[in-house]
């Protein structure tokens, strides 16, 4: 065993090349210089090492860089990245988007692993905010990335990053997340005109407050029912029948099919039946004529 720690004569590696795949684990340990490995990391990915051999190479790098690998090494880790633990990655300082892309490429097609989640976390924290280029990259690899962030994390997203978001990136976002993202989208898209603006903001409207929906209703936007059904119930309830009619335009007829579902059901309960009848859709459940409507939320605010 003791003899095996010494590198056999003539086996010392002068460079990282394909000949190393024939080395036993102990030979790699004994014959590959860690500094050489670090400078030639870009070659490792092209060589079909076994997982056991990759373990040895990782061990050598760990010994050389106990405080964490430098970015020059990280950028060329390739498949060796899959051997890293979240604890290893927490020691890194990754600042280059190219490095991030290279490592995400290794994991492409797989679910987001704890390693990748840690890497992204380190990268974003290092940058201080989730800028547009980063978000572009992350959503390209993981369309659901944005919706995996907490509302607190989303708060650091600058409005300019919202331009990188595609409608499908928001598919799994819940109302709390859209609450945070919608105002940022409103800021980001505010210099666009009416029709262009609505196309861009539509996916984010699940976070829109009542006042914004009222304003949109004046813009002839013709919101589709699928979008309307994703609106916050508390934002829809104060809308009048006339405002909902303007907001939906020709799609208003779709309310009938959704009258038993939120937010339509709750909205109907808040409207005067007379007003609902003006739509001619046969919507039932409104407040009968002659009844007094008390706005309890207003009363609570006053008390």
């Amino acid at each position: 065993e003791v003899e095996k720690t010494a590198c056999p004569s003539g086996k010392k590696a002068r460079e990282i090349d394909e000949s190393l795949i024939f080395y036993k684990k102990w030979e790699l340990e004994a014959c590959v210089d860690a500094a050489l490995l670090a400078t030639q990391m870009d070659r490792v990915n092209a060589i079909p090492f076994t997982y056991e051999q990759l373990d040895v190479l990782k061990h050598k790098l760990d010994e050389l860089y106990p405080q964490g690998y430098p970015e020059s090494v990280i950028q060329h880790l390739g498949y060796l990245f899959l051997k890293m633990s979240p604890e290893d990655i927490r020691k890194w300082n990754v600042t280059s988007l190219e490095t991030l892309k290279a490592l995400l490429e290794v994991n492409k097609g797989h679910e987001m692993s704890p390693q990748v989640a840690t890497l992204i976390d380190r990268f974003v924290k290092g940058r201080g905010q989730l800028d547009k280029d980063t978000l572009d990259t992350l959503t390209a690899f993981y369309p659901g990335y944005l919706c995996s962030l907490s509302p607190e994390e989303l708060s650091s997203v600058p409005p300019s990053s919202i331009w990188a978001v595609r409608p499908q990136d928001l598919d799994t976002c819940d109302p709390r997340q859209l609450d945070v993202l919608y105002p940022k989208a409103r800021l980001a898209f505010q210099n666009m005109n009416g029709s262009e603006y609505f196309v861009k903001i539509q996916s984010f409207l699940g976070g829109a407050p009542t006042e914004d929906l009222k304003a949109l209703s004046q813009q002839n936007v013709s919101m589709d029912l699928a979008t309307f059904m994703k609106l916050r119930t508390d934002a829809v309830l104060p809308l009048t029948v006339a405002e909902v009619q303007k907001l939906l335009g020709p799609h208003v007829e779709g309310l009938k099919a959704e009258e038993r579902h939120r937010p339509v059901r709750d909205w109907i309960l808040r409207q005067r039946q007379d007003d609902l009848d003006t739509l001619g859709l046969g919507l039932q459940g409104g407040i009968p004529n002659g009844y007094l409507v008390l706005d309890l939320s207003m009363q609570e605010a006053l008390s």
Partner: antibody
Framework: EVQLVQSGAEVKKPGASVKVSCKAS????????VQWVRQAPGQGLEWMGI????????TYAQKFQGRVTMTRDTSTSTVYMELSSLRSEDTAVYYC???????????????WGQGTLVTVSS | SYELTQPPSVSVSPGQTASITCSGD??????ASWYQQKPGQSPVLVIY???RRPSGIPERFSGSNSGNTATLTISGTQAMDEADYYC?????????FGTGTKVTVL
């Protein structure tokens, strides 16, 4: 008539923090976005950030990122702006302002507080 | 960073027209707002979304925006219009205010 009433003048030492409040009277305040703008003596206006009606979403100007925190207490219709690690250059009048003008995408500020003078001096 | 440049001062006789310009790269692609501020007072919004007037603002205030320049026009200027005026627009991740123009009514 809608009014935004801000807290009184403050004198702070360098390195300290200041928290300015902005309270609405006369209408349902929690329906609107609130922004903060400051003005150093004899200087122009400088935008600091914005907070949404529910208080869960904030966007800060890059210059103040990491030093400013805007919060909202919907139960008391009050918005707060806290600025930390104060330096002499932060001496200014701090204004809160609301976006109430009808508009689907703009954030023009049409209701303003009276301003709060914050003096940073050792 | 984005900059909006205004002339430091504009003088106008009562009843005449005052024009205040605000220049910025491709400013016409953004919406401009204008604020009036009198000494010791909070700013007042006079124009938003290039040319819209909030309720309570006199008709003599109007705005336009195209190319690289937004313009605030005060027709039939009155003594009460003497104040500082600031333009404002959104760029990337922040609202930018212009350098400010002092309007003096002679």
């Amino acid at each position: 008539e809608v009014q935004l009433v801000q807290s009184g003048a403050e004198v702070k030492k360098p390195g300290a923090s200041v928290k300015v409040s902005c309270k609405a009277s006369g209408d349902t305040f929690n329906r609107y976005y609130v922004q903060w703008v400051r003005q150093a003596p004899g200087q122009g206006l400088e935008w600091m950030g914005i907070i949404n009606p529910s208080g869960v979403s904030t966007t800060y100007a890059q210059k103040f990122q990491g030093r400013v925190t805007m919060t909202r207490d919907t139960s008391t219709s009050t918005v707060y702006m806290e600025l930390s690690s104060l330096r002499s250059e932060d001496t200014a009048v701090y204004y809160c302002a609301e976006s109430r003008v009808p508009g689907y995408n703009i954030f023009a500020m049409d209701v303003w507080g009276q301003g709060t003078l914050v003096t940073v001096s050792s | 960073s984005y900059e909006l440049t205004q002339p430091p001062s504009v003088s106008v006789s009562p009843g005449q027209t005052a024009s205040i310009t605000c220049s910025g790269d491709k400013l016409g692609d953004k919406y401009a707002s204008w604020y009036q501020q009198k000494p010791g007072q909070s700013p007042v919004l006079v124009i938003y979304q290039d040319n819209r007037r909030p309720s309570g603002i006199p008709e003599r205030f109007s705005g336009s925006n195209s190319g690289n320049t937004a313009t605030l026009t005060i027709s039939g200027t009155q003594a009460m219009d003497e104040a500082d005026y600031y333009c404002q627009a959104w760029d990337s991740d922040t609202y930018v205010f212009g350098t400010g123009t002092k309007v003096t009514v002679l």
